[in-house]
Protein backbone atom coordinates (compact mmCIF):
# COMPACT_ATOMS: atom_id res chain seq x y z
CA UNK A 1 0.00 0.00 0.00
CA UNK A 2 1.57 3.13 -1.02
CA UNK A 3 2.11 5.87 1.99
CA UNK A 4 3.02 9.51 2.70
CA UNK A 5 5.39 10.83 4.90
CA UNK A 6 5.21 14.12 6.09
CA UNK A 7 8.24 16.47 8.20
CA UNK A 8 7.59 19.80 9.39
CA UNK A 9 10.80 22.13 10.18
CA UNK A 10 11.90 25.51 11.51
CA UNK A 11 14.84 27.43 9.84
CA UNK A 12 17.90 27.91 11.97
CA UNK A 13 18.32 31.15 10.30
CA UNK A 14 15.13 32.92 10.00
CA UNK A 15 12.59 31.63 12.92
CA UNK A 16 9.77 33.08 10.72
CA UNK A 17 10.72 30.67 8.01
CA UNK A 18 9.25 27.02 7.88
CA UNK A 19 9.65 24.33 5.21
CA UNK A 20 7.15 21.31 4.85
CA UNK A 21 8.74 18.34 3.37
CA UNK A 22 6.24 14.77 2.21
CA UNK A 23 7.35 12.31 0.29
CA UNK A 24 5.42 9.30 -0.92
CA UNK A 25 6.24 5.39 -0.84
CA UNK A 26 5.07 2.87 -2.77
CA UNK A 27 4.29 1.81 -6.52
CA UNK A 28 2.81 4.14 -9.19
CA UNK A 29 3.41 7.26 -10.64
CA UNK A 30 2.23 10.25 -8.62
CA UNK A 31 0.03 12.90 -11.25
CA UNK A 32 -0.66 15.29 -8.42
CA UNK A 33 0.79 16.71 -5.28
CA UNK A 34 -1.25 18.72 -3.05
CA UNK A 35 -0.06 20.85 0.14
CA UNK A 36 -2.36 22.20 2.75
CA UNK A 37 -2.83 23.83 6.07
CA UNK A 38 -5.17 23.51 9.03
CA UNK A 39 -6.13 20.27 7.89
CA UNK A 40 -6.57 17.76 4.99
CA UNK A 41 -6.94 18.98 1.39
CA UNK A 42 -11.43 18.66 1.21
CA UNK A 43 -11.61 18.87 5.21
CA UNK A 44 -11.13 22.07 6.07
CA UNK A 45 -7.79 22.91 5.05
CA UNK A 46 -6.21 25.67 2.81
CA UNK A 47 -4.28 24.68 0.13
CA UNK A 48 -0.74 26.37 -0.34
CA UNK A 49 0.57 24.71 -3.14
CA UNK A 50 -0.25 22.02 -5.65
CA UNK A 51 2.53 20.23 -7.49
CA UNK A 52 2.45 18.43 -10.73
CA UNK A 53 5.69 16.34 -11.99
CA UNK A 54 5.57 17.73 -15.45
CA UNK A 55 3.82 20.77 -15.58
CA UNK A 56 5.10 22.66 -12.64
CA UNK A 57 3.89 23.76 -9.42
CA UNK A 58 1.30 26.46 -8.12
CA UNK A 59 1.16 28.13 -4.91
CA UNK A 60 -0.69 30.85 -2.56
CA UNK A 61 0.55 32.99 0.14
CA UNK A 62 2.17 32.17 2.18
CA UNK A 63 3.95 29.85 0.20
CA UNK A 64 7.04 31.34 -0.40
CA UNK A 65 8.48 28.31 -2.70
CA UNK A 66 7.41 24.58 -4.02
CA UNK A 67 9.66 22.59 -5.60
CA UNK A 68 10.21 18.78 -6.19
CA UNK A 69 12.84 17.39 -4.25
CA UNK A 70 13.10 13.94 -5.97
CA UNK A 71 10.90 12.27 -8.14
CA UNK A 72 8.72 11.10 -4.95
CA UNK A 73 9.03 13.72 -2.15
CA UNK A 74 8.71 17.38 -2.74
CA UNK A 75 8.93 20.44 -0.12
CA UNK A 76 7.11 23.88 0.40
CA UNK A 77 9.63 26.83 1.97
CA UNK A 78 6.99 29.18 4.64
CA UNK A 79 7.50 32.62 5.13
CA UNK A 80 5.10 33.48 8.25
CA UNK A 81 5.06 37.25 8.50
CA UNK A 82 3.43 37.42 11.70
CA UNK A 83 5.49 37.79 15.05
CA UNK A 84 3.13 34.98 16.34
CA UNK A 85 4.68 32.26 14.53
CA UNK A 86 1.27 30.82 13.55
CA UNK A 87 3.12 27.95 11.92
CA UNK A 88 4.27 26.28 15.10
CA UNK A 89 0.93 25.30 15.99
CA UNK A 90 -0.43 24.34 12.47
CA UNK A 91 -0.91 21.29 11.24
CA UNK A 92 0.14 20.69 7.63
CA UNK A 93 -1.18 17.88 5.31
CA UNK A 94 0.23 16.34 1.56
CA UNK A 95 -1.64 14.53 -0.61
CA UNK A 96 -0.37 12.64 -3.14
CA UNK A 97 -2.67 11.94 -6.02
CA UNK A 98 -2.16 8.70 -8.76
CA UNK A 99 -4.94 8.84 -11.02
CA UNK A 100 -7.11 6.93 -11.67
CA UNK A 101 -5.33 4.91 -8.66
CA UNK A 102 -6.32 6.67 -5.70
CA UNK A 103 -4.54 9.29 -3.39
CA UNK A 104 -3.18 9.10 -0.25
CA UNK A 105 -2.92 11.97 2.60
CA UNK A 106 -0.61 12.12 5.62
CA UNK A 107 -0.20 15.22 7.94
CA UNK A 108 2.45 16.46 10.21
CA UNK A 109 3.29 20.04 12.47
CA UNK A 110 6.02 21.32 14.20
CA UNK A 111 7.37 19.02 17.06
CA UNK A 112 6.31 21.26 20.38
CA UNK A 113 9.65 21.22 21.73
CA UNK A 114 11.62 21.66 18.72
CA UNK A 115 14.57 24.18 18.81
CA UNK A 116 15.34 26.27 15.67
CA UNK A 117 17.29 24.69 13.41
CA UNK A 118 16.92 21.28 15.40
CA UNK A 119 14.19 19.96 13.86
CA UNK A 120 15.70 17.02 12.08
CA UNK A 121 13.63 13.76 11.43
CA UNK A 122 12.65 12.14 14.18
CA UNK A 123 14.70 9.06 15.39
CA UNK A 124 14.31 6.30 12.99
CA UNK A 125 12.93 3.16 13.68
CA UNK A 126 14.69 -0.20 12.57
CA UNK A 127 11.80 -1.80 10.95
CA UNK A 128 11.97 -4.10 7.89
CA UNK A 129 9.37 -5.37 5.30
CA UNK A 130 8.78 -8.94 5.53
CA UNK A 131 10.69 -9.95 1.74
CA UNK A 132 14.01 -8.09 3.14
CA UNK A 133 13.99 -9.82 6.16
CA UNK A 134 13.09 -13.18 4.48
CA UNK A 135 16.33 -11.74 2.30
CA UNK A 136 18.49 -11.59 5.10
CA UNK A 137 17.88 -14.74 7.20
CA UNK A 138 18.42 -16.50 3.89
CA UNK A 139 21.78 -14.49 3.89
CA UNK A 140 22.16 -15.24 7.43
CA UNK A 141 22.22 -18.87 6.69
CA UNK A 142 24.57 -18.55 3.91
CA UNK A 143 27.07 -16.89 6.12
CA UNK A 144 26.66 -19.73 8.66
CA UNK A 145 27.25 -22.06 6.03
CA UNK A 146 30.08 -20.42 4.75
CA UNK A 147 31.48 -20.03 8.43
CA UNK A 148 30.97 -24.02 9.41
CA UNK A 149 32.61 -24.83 6.07
CA UNK A 150 35.79 -22.88 7.23
CA UNK A 151 35.67 -24.34 10.24
CA UNK A 152 35.64 -27.69 8.35
CA UNK A 153 38.40 -26.97 6.34
CA UNK A 154 40.24 -25.39 9.22
CA UNK A 155 40.05 -29.00 11.22
CA UNK A 156 41.51 -30.16 8.08
CA UNK A 157 44.29 -28.66 7.60
CA UNK A 158 46.72 -31.35 7.73
CA UNK A 159 44.85 -32.90 4.16
CA UNK A 160 45.51 -31.25 1.28
CA UNK A 161 42.96 -29.59 0.02
CA UNK A 162 42.10 -27.14 -2.76
CA UNK A 163 41.71 -23.36 -1.69
CA UNK A 164 38.18 -22.02 -2.47
CA UNK A 165 38.51 -18.51 -4.39
CA UNK A 166 35.41 -16.54 -3.52
CA UNK A 167 33.48 -15.26 -6.05
CA UNK A 168 33.07 -11.28 -5.92
CA UNK A 169 29.26 -10.13 -6.96
CA UNK A 170 29.76 -6.47 -8.53
CA UNK A 171 26.37 -5.70 -7.73
CA UNK A 172 24.87 -2.62 -6.33
CA UNK A 173 24.13 -2.26 -2.42
CA UNK A 174 20.67 -0.84 -1.34
CA UNK A 175 20.72 0.93 1.50
CA UNK A 176 17.36 1.04 3.55
CA UNK A 177 17.17 3.57 6.45
CA UNK A 178 13.98 3.77 8.32
CA UNK A 179 12.81 7.24 9.55
CA UNK A 180 9.39 7.85 11.67
CA UNK A 181 7.17 10.93 9.72
CA UNK A 182 6.18 13.81 11.77
CA UNK A 183 2.54 13.43 12.38
CA UNK A 184 0.48 14.54 15.22
CA UNK A 185 -0.47 11.69 16.96
CA UNK A 186 3.35 10.19 16.82
CA UNK A 187 5.31 9.60 19.89
CA UNK A 188 8.90 9.72 20.15
CA UNK A 189 11.10 7.24 19.24
CA UNK A 190 14.50 6.13 20.05
CA UNK A 191 16.14 2.87 18.16
CA UNK A 192 18.62 3.46 15.78
CA UNK A 193 18.84 3.76 12.18
CA UNK A 194 18.16 0.42 10.66
CA UNK A 195 20.76 -0.10 7.99
CA UNK A 196 20.36 -3.05 4.99
CA UNK A 197 22.58 -3.84 2.77
CA UNK A 198 22.00 -6.17 0.21
CA UNK A 199 23.04 -7.41 -3.17
CA UNK A 200 19.97 -6.86 -5.83
CA UNK A 201 18.52 -4.26 -7.63
CA UNK A 202 15.54 -2.47 -5.58
CA UNK A 203 13.35 -2.85 -8.39
CA UNK A 204 12.85 -6.33 -7.99
CA UNK A 205 11.25 -5.95 -4.90
CA UNK A 206 7.84 -7.32 -5.25
CA UNK A 207 6.39 -3.73 -5.00
CA UNK A 208 9.34 -1.65 -6.54
CA UNK A 209 8.12 2.14 -7.46
CA UNK A 210 8.63 2.72 -11.09
CA UNK A 211 11.13 5.25 -10.28
CA UNK A 212 13.13 2.63 -8.91
CA UNK A 213 12.63 3.51 -5.29
CA UNK A 214 11.19 0.18 -3.43
CA UNK A 215 7.91 0.44 -1.86
CA UNK A 216 8.75 0.39 1.87
CA UNK A 217 5.60 1.55 3.39
CA UNK A 218 4.64 3.70 6.70
CA UNK A 219 1.54 4.41 8.03
CA UNK A 220 -1.24 7.07 6.92
CA UNK A 221 -4.36 7.89 5.32
CA UNK A 222 -5.47 6.22 2.44
CA UNK A 223 -8.22 6.86 0.05
CA UNK A 224 -8.50 4.60 -2.49
CA UNK A 225 -10.26 5.62 -5.52
CA UNK A 226 -11.13 4.02 -8.67
CA UNK A 227 -11.17 0.71 -9.45
CA UNK A 228 -7.95 -0.17 -9.38
CA UNK A 229 -7.30 0.80 -5.84
CA UNK A 230 -7.01 -2.11 -3.09
CA UNK A 231 -6.32 -1.55 0.38
CA UNK A 232 -3.68 -3.98 2.09
CA UNK A 233 -2.65 -4.03 6.03
CA UNK A 234 1.11 -2.02 6.13
CA UNK A 235 3.89 -4.51 6.69
CA UNK A 236 5.30 -1.78 8.70
CA UNK A 237 4.32 -0.53 12.15
CA UNK A 238 2.36 2.36 12.45
CA UNK A 239 4.29 6.00 11.84
CA UNK A 240 7.44 4.32 10.09
CA UNK A 241 8.71 4.39 6.37
CA UNK A 242 11.89 3.88 4.88
CA UNK A 243 13.32 5.80 2.34
CA UNK A 244 15.53 3.49 -0.41
CA UNK A 245 18.65 5.59 -1.95
CA UNK A 246 19.76 4.25 -4.95
CA UNK A 247 23.01 5.47 -6.86
CA UNK A 248 21.28 4.70 -10.10
CA UNK A 249 18.94 7.20 -9.89
CA UNK A 250 18.71 11.51 -9.59
CA UNK A 251 20.76 12.80 -6.93
CA UNK A 252 18.98 14.22 -3.81
CA UNK A 253 17.38 17.49 -4.65
CA UNK A 254 17.78 17.45 -8.22
CA UNK A 255 14.48 17.06 -10.42
CA UNK A 256 15.23 14.71 -13.83
CA UNK A 257 14.97 17.12 -17.12
CA UNK A 258 11.75 17.58 -18.30
CA UNK A 259 11.84 14.94 -21.08
CA UNK A 260 8.39 15.48 -22.77
CA UNK A 261 5.76 12.39 -22.93
CA UNK A 262 7.03 9.57 -23.79
CA UNK A 263 10.25 9.37 -23.03
CA UNK A 264 12.21 7.83 -19.93
CA UNK A 265 11.98 10.10 -17.10
CA UNK A 266 13.50 7.54 -14.34
CA UNK A 267 15.56 4.58 -15.23
CA UNK A 268 14.28 1.09 -13.86
CA UNK A 269 17.01 -1.45 -13.15
CA UNK A 270 15.05 -3.88 -14.93
CA UNK A 271 15.96 -1.58 -18.51
CA UNK A 272 13.68 1.63 -19.79
CA UNK A 273 10.54 2.29 -18.62
CA UNK A 274 8.80 4.36 -20.93
CA UNK A 275 6.65 6.97 -18.62
CA UNK A 276 3.35 7.69 -19.76
CA UNK A 277 3.25 11.49 -20.91
CA UNK A 278 0.39 13.85 -19.74
CA UNK A 279 -3.34 13.59 -21.11
CA UNK A 280 -4.13 17.10 -21.73
CA UNK A 281 -7.84 18.49 -23.26
CA UNK A 282 -6.70 20.00 -26.70
CA UNK B 1 -13.63 15.93 2.26
CA UNK B 2 -14.50 15.88 -1.86
CA UNK B 3 -16.81 13.78 -3.06
CA UNK B 4 -17.42 12.52 -6.76
CA UNK B 5 -20.65 10.51 -7.65
CA UNK B 6 -20.87 10.10 -11.50
CA UNK B 7 -24.25 8.04 -13.01
CA UNK B 8 -25.68 7.51 -16.47
CA UNK B 9 -23.26 5.43 -18.08
CA UNK B 10 -24.61 2.29 -19.46
CA UNK B 11 -24.79 0.74 -23.37
CA UNK B 12 -25.81 2.26 -26.32
CA UNK B 13 -25.73 1.79 -29.88
CA UNK B 14 -23.62 3.36 -32.05
CA UNK B 15 -24.92 7.32 -33.38
CA UNK B 16 -26.81 6.92 -29.57
CA UNK B 17 -26.64 9.11 -26.95
CA UNK B 18 -26.14 9.32 -23.16
CA UNK B 19 -25.68 12.04 -20.84
CA UNK B 20 -23.12 11.66 -17.64
CA UNK B 21 -23.95 13.03 -14.51
CA UNK B 22 -21.69 14.10 -11.63
CA UNK B 23 -23.12 14.83 -8.34
CA UNK B 24 -20.16 16.63 -6.60
CA UNK B 25 -19.86 17.33 -2.88
CA UNK B 26 -17.07 18.92 0.00
CA UNK B 27 -15.16 21.41 -2.32
CA UNK B 28 -12.52 23.18 -0.61
CA UNK B 29 -11.01 26.83 -2.08
CA UNK B 30 -8.80 27.07 -5.04
CA UNK B 31 -9.68 24.12 -7.28
CA UNK B 32 -10.34 26.08 -10.40
CA UNK B 33 -11.52 23.42 -13.00
CA UNK B 34 -14.13 20.16 -13.38
CA UNK B 35 -13.93 17.83 -16.03
CA UNK B 36 -14.20 14.99 -17.75
CA UNK B 37 -11.46 12.08 -18.22
CA UNK B 38 -11.94 8.66 -19.86
CA UNK B 39 -9.73 5.05 -20.00
CA UNK B 40 -10.67 3.14 -22.52
CA UNK B 41 -10.09 -0.66 -22.50
CA UNK B 42 -6.37 -1.26 -22.36
CA UNK B 43 -5.80 1.99 -23.08
CA UNK B 44 -4.27 5.79 -20.67
CA UNK B 45 -6.32 8.03 -19.76
CA UNK B 46 -7.63 10.94 -21.95
CA UNK B 47 -9.00 14.22 -20.54
CA UNK B 48 -12.05 14.36 -22.45
CA UNK B 49 -13.62 17.85 -21.83
CA UNK B 50 -13.46 20.85 -18.93
CA UNK B 51 -14.82 23.73 -17.98
CA UNK B 52 -12.94 26.73 -16.18
CA UNK B 53 -13.74 27.98 -12.87
CA UNK B 54 -14.71 31.08 -15.44
CA UNK B 55 -17.14 28.48 -17.24
CA UNK B 56 -15.32 28.47 -20.48
CA UNK B 57 -15.60 24.97 -21.78
CA UNK B 58 -12.61 22.80 -23.51
CA UNK B 59 -12.70 19.70 -25.26
CA UNK B 60 -10.45 17.10 -26.85
CA UNK B 61 -10.40 17.10 -30.57
CA UNK B 62 -12.10 13.88 -30.94
CA UNK B 63 -14.90 14.86 -29.22
CA UNK B 64 -15.63 18.55 -30.42
CA UNK B 65 -19.43 18.85 -31.94
CA UNK B 66 -20.71 15.84 -30.56
CA UNK B 67 -19.94 16.17 -26.76
CA UNK B 68 -21.40 18.84 -24.60
CA UNK B 69 -19.70 20.14 -20.96
CA UNK B 70 -21.90 21.92 -18.72
CA UNK B 71 -22.54 22.08 -14.92
CA UNK B 72 -25.09 23.51 -12.47
CA UNK B 73 -23.70 25.29 -9.46
CA UNK B 74 -26.51 25.43 -7.77
CA UNK B 75 -27.39 21.48 -7.93
CA UNK B 76 -22.68 21.31 -7.21
CA UNK B 77 -23.20 18.88 -10.26
CA UNK B 78 -21.33 18.25 -13.73
CA UNK B 79 -22.67 17.30 -16.84
CA UNK B 80 -21.45 15.44 -20.13
CA UNK B 81 -23.74 15.01 -23.31
CA UNK B 82 -22.54 12.75 -25.55
CA UNK B 83 -24.35 12.79 -29.11
CA UNK B 84 -23.09 10.83 -32.19
CA UNK B 85 -21.51 8.41 -30.01
CA UNK B 86 -18.59 5.57 -31.66
CA UNK B 87 -17.88 2.60 -30.88
CA UNK B 88 -14.15 4.09 -29.70
CA UNK B 89 -15.95 6.51 -27.12
CA UNK B 90 -16.40 3.01 -25.10
CA UNK B 91 -14.57 3.37 -21.44
CA UNK B 92 -15.12 4.17 -18.06
CA UNK B 93 -15.83 7.75 -17.95
CA UNK B 94 -14.45 9.83 -14.23
CA UNK B 95 -15.34 12.71 -13.22
CA UNK B 96 -12.43 15.16 -12.18
CA UNK B 97 -11.61 18.04 -10.05
CA UNK B 98 -8.50 19.84 -10.42
CA UNK B 99 -5.69 22.55 -11.27
CA UNK B 100 -5.10 24.45 -14.25
CA UNK B 101 -1.44 24.72 -14.85
CA UNK B 102 -2.09 25.54 -18.61
CA UNK B 103 -5.40 26.47 -20.60
CA UNK B 104 -5.31 22.78 -22.26
CA UNK B 105 -5.16 20.89 -19.17
CA UNK B 106 -7.10 20.32 -15.71
CA UNK B 107 -4.72 18.20 -13.25
CA UNK B 108 -7.23 15.88 -11.42
CA UNK B 109 -7.22 16.43 -8.01
CA UNK B 110 -10.20 14.59 -6.99
CA UNK B 111 -12.66 12.19 -9.06
CA UNK B 112 -14.91 9.69 -8.63
CA UNK B 113 -15.18 5.87 -9.11
CA UNK B 114 -15.60 6.30 -12.73
CA UNK B 115 -19.02 5.03 -14.52
CA UNK B 116 -18.89 2.51 -17.84
CA UNK B 117 -20.02 3.18 -21.32
CA UNK B 118 -20.25 0.94 -23.72
CA UNK B 119 -20.89 1.76 -27.51
CA UNK B 120 -21.75 -1.24 -29.40
CA UNK B 121 -23.93 -2.66 -31.47
Known amino acids: TPEVWVQVQMEATELSSFTVHCGFLGPGSISLVTVSWGGPDGAGGTKLAVLHPELGTRQWAPARQARWETQSSISLALEDSGASSPFANTTFCCKFASFPEGSWESCGSLPPSSDPGLSAPPTPVPILRADLAGILGLSGVLLFGCGYLLHLLRRQKHRPTPRLQPSHTNSQALTAQAWAPSQASQAALHDPYATINTSFCPATLDTAHPNGWASLPTHAAHQPQGPAASASTPILARGSFVSVENGLYTQAGERPPHTGPGLTLFPDCRGPRAVEGRFGVR | EVQLVESGGGLVQPGGSLRLSCAAS????????MGWFRQAPGKGLEGVAHIDSDGIPRYVDSVKGRFTISRDNAKNSLYLQMNSLRAEDTAVYYCVVGFKFDEDYCAPNDWGQGTMVTVSS
Open chain 2, 26 to 33: GFTSRTDC
